[in-house]
């Protein structure tokens, strides 16, 4: 079941999925000046069986100026630097995503893809939040959100994360509420879809959150 909405927006924070549940779809979008190749896929789809999941279809972009060609232009160094990638840096990868059954790992970038990736999540998907550069978590419970089905409608749980500018918190050096334990979560926010592996991702990620940042933009 597709989630009807996007994950909640937290001021000065971004979110990221560590792995994508089967059924997730990703728009095949190209950066300005490029378009999908003729008869190219509109979406990638995370699909698989009990032992292996992978992305069906492949996104391919070609220059808008050229007709009937699949020539793919390699970005110049400054273009590559500017690109906001959805790949997280290796120190940030909490666990091997392939170890999550029924999930796909982050699709590798395709040439000349758009700077922003638009995912269409399914029920049971978990995303993780962190403060953007220049902001820190003042106090925080679980910094994740799960898409849940309730009374036939989908909704995202509310992440317990507040991001504040570093100047505002300088009077409280090093002060930060400890991460709430799963037992401390309100019943309404507890999801039967959270697996041990999912929680392991969340806790390991929390440990590395303050020192690194991912730059994906989401709508």
């Amino acid at each position: 079941e597709l989630c009807d909405d996007d994950p909640p927006e937290i001021p000065h924070a971004t979110f990221k999925a560590m792995a994508y549940k089967e059924g997730t779809m990703l728009n095949c979008e190209c950066k300005r000046g490029f378009r999908r190749i003729k008869s190219g896929s509109l979406y990638m789809l995370c699909t698989g069986n009990s032992s292996h999941s992978s992305w069906d279809n492949q996104c391919q972009c070609t220059s808008s100026a050229t007709r009937n060609t699949t020539k793919q232009v390699t970005p110049q160094p400054e273009e590559q630097k500017e690109r906001k990638t959805t790949e997280m840096q290796s120190p940030m990868q909490p666990v091997d995503q392939a170890s999550l059954p029924g999930h796909c790992r982050e699709p590798p970038p395709w040439e000349n893809e758009a700077t922003e990736r638009i995912y269409h999540f399914v029920v049971g998907q978990m995303v993780y939040y962190q403060c953007v550069q220049g902001y820190r978590a003042l106090h925080r419970g679980p910094a994740e959100s799960v898409c849940k089905m309730t009374h036939g409608k989908t909704r995202w749980t509310q992440p317990q994360l507040i991001c504040t500018g570093e100047m505002e918190t300088s009077q409280f050096p090093g002060e930060e509420k400890p991460q709430a334990s799963p037992e401390g979560r309100p019943e309404s926010e507890t999801s039967c879809l959270v697996t041990t592996t999912d929680f392991q991702i969340q806790t390991e990620m929390a440990a590395t959150m303050e020192t690194s940042i991912f730059t994906t933009e989401y709508q």
Partner: nanobody, 111 residues
């Protein structure tokens, strides 16, 4: 899920025009790449036109210059304006978003 409902099909003479509409619900419309497909009797479903989130259109060669795809994000609707219709345009026209399809609307071009 995404629900898609097409309308606007009908019988038209060669050279005539029709405007198809597809109303979408159930998912943030502005995040969707929208497409129109068509299927003629005994033939495979073929892509007619797509429109990006920013409104950029793409057309099949067979309809380029005659058909125009557009979207209204405020109304959660995508349109297909079909001009200079030909008998070979006769088909059931389907709206598509993600893996979801409308029920189709019949377009018949005949004198």
């Amino acid at each position: 899920e995404v629900q898609l409902v097409e309308s606007g099909g009908g019988l038209v003479q060669p050279g005539g025009s029709l405007r198809l509409s597809c109303a979408a619900s159930g998912r943030s419309f502005s995040t969707l790449i929208m497409a129109w497909y068509r299927q003629a009797p005994g033939k495979q479903r073929e892509l007619v036109a797509t429109i990006e989130r920013d409104g950029t259109p793409t057309y099949a060669d067979s309809v380029k210059g005659r058909f125009t795809i557009s979207r209204d994000n405020a109304k959660n609707t995508v349109y297909l304006q079909m001009n200079s219709l030909r008998p070979e345009d006769t088909a059931v026209y389907y709206c598509n978003a993600l893996r979801f399809w409308g029920q189709g609307t019949q377009v018949t071009v005949s004198s």
